[in-house]
């Protein structure tokens, strides 16, 4: 099939890097400048992502494979591809409409993105607060009263946080 | 080709007023919240204001509340910000950005970049 294609379209030959240049007789030309072709057969080439702004180059592009942006620093990535860039906060504060703003009483957020979460009510497992929370940690849970009884020392961290969608106020 | 430019910066002295706009095409402007940054020597970018797509939500970051006011006009394709009382502190690159799609309800991350005009507040 695939030798019966190649004399059907002339293309199919093209390999990455190239296109079948229909002004040239079909020839495989190379890619021009800021631009590329991923797969063989193309009779154009795409233009190669620019990383402009708040984009940074994280890998430059190539006649075979598009540039890939990251963001500058203070930003974060966000969507397939790195498609948008959004601003870090502190930890102990969440990004809203109004900017970055500190975690209300009773929440945290341990990192420079995402929304602040509640912190772990240890009462639901039936132990009692160990250490604390804060803006930016979880409290740590400890046993309950009636487990500490000599010799026993059983401290349970709370779970690894997921990271949240944004729920902006 | 996407595209937002922006213009209006210059040298003005502390208390003076400028007024920047960028101006938007290649895409629907009527559909997306628009942004300023802006970065002052040495230090990082800043948010600075925003804008839903129909004007009924401004935000601005705590320090130039009060003097600057973000505005848009649709049918020109166009982002402004008014600044007024301008102090030396305000001496920074600005740049205008596109909310991307879902911005405000999901995220807050933009899109599309200007290439910066050069606000300096001296006297």
């Known amino acids: 099939f695939e030798r019966t294609r190649s004399l059907q379209d002339p293309c199919s030959n093209c390999p990455a890097g190239t296109f079948c240049d229909n002004n040239r007789n079909q020839i495989c030309s190379p890619c021009p400048p800021n631009s590329f072709s991923s797969a063989g057969g193309q009779r154009t080439c795409d233009i190669c992502r620019q990383c402009k702004g708040v984009f940074r180059t994280r890998k430059e592009c190539s006649s075979t494979s598009n540039a890939e942006c990251d963001c500058t620093p203070g930003f974060h990535c966000l969507g397939a591809g790195c498609s948008m860039c959004e601003q870090d906060c502190k930890q102990g504060q969440e990004l809203t409409k109004k900017g970055c703003k500190d975690c209300c009483f009773g929440t945290f957020n341990d990192q420079k993105r995402g929304i602040c979460r509640p912190w772990t009510n240890c009462s639901l497992d039936g132990k009692s607060v160990l250490v604390n929370g804060t803006k930016e940690r979880d409290v740590v849970c400890g046993p309950s009263p009636a487990d500490l009884s000599p010799g026993a020392s059983s401290v349970t961290p709370p779970a690894p946080a997921r990271e949240p969608g944004h729920s902006p106020q | 080709e996407v595209q937002l430019v922006e213009s209006g910066g210059g040298l003005v002295q502390p208390g003076g007023s400028l007024r920047l706009s960028c101006a938007a095409s290649?895409?629907?402007?009527?559909?997306?919240?628009m942004t300023w940054f802006r970065q002052a020597p040495g230090k990082g970018l800043e948010w600075v204001a925003h804008?839903?797509?129909?004007?009924?939500?401004?935000y601005y970051v705590d320090s130039v509340k009060g003097r600057f006011t973000i505005s848009r006009d649709n049918a020109k394709n166009s982002l402004y910000l008014q600044m007024n009382s301008l102090r030396a502190e305000d001496t920074a690159v600005y740049y205008c950005?596109?909310?991307?799609?879902?911005?405000?309800?999901?995220?807050?991350?933009?899109?599309?970049w200007g290439q910066g005009t050069t606000v300096t507040v001296s006297s």
């Open positions: 290649g895409f629907t402007f009527s559909s997306h919240w």
């Open positions: 950005a596109r909310g991307g799609e879902g911005y405000s309800i999901s995220h807050f991350g933009v899109d599309v």
């Open positions: 804008i839903k797509e129909d004007e009924s939500e401004k």
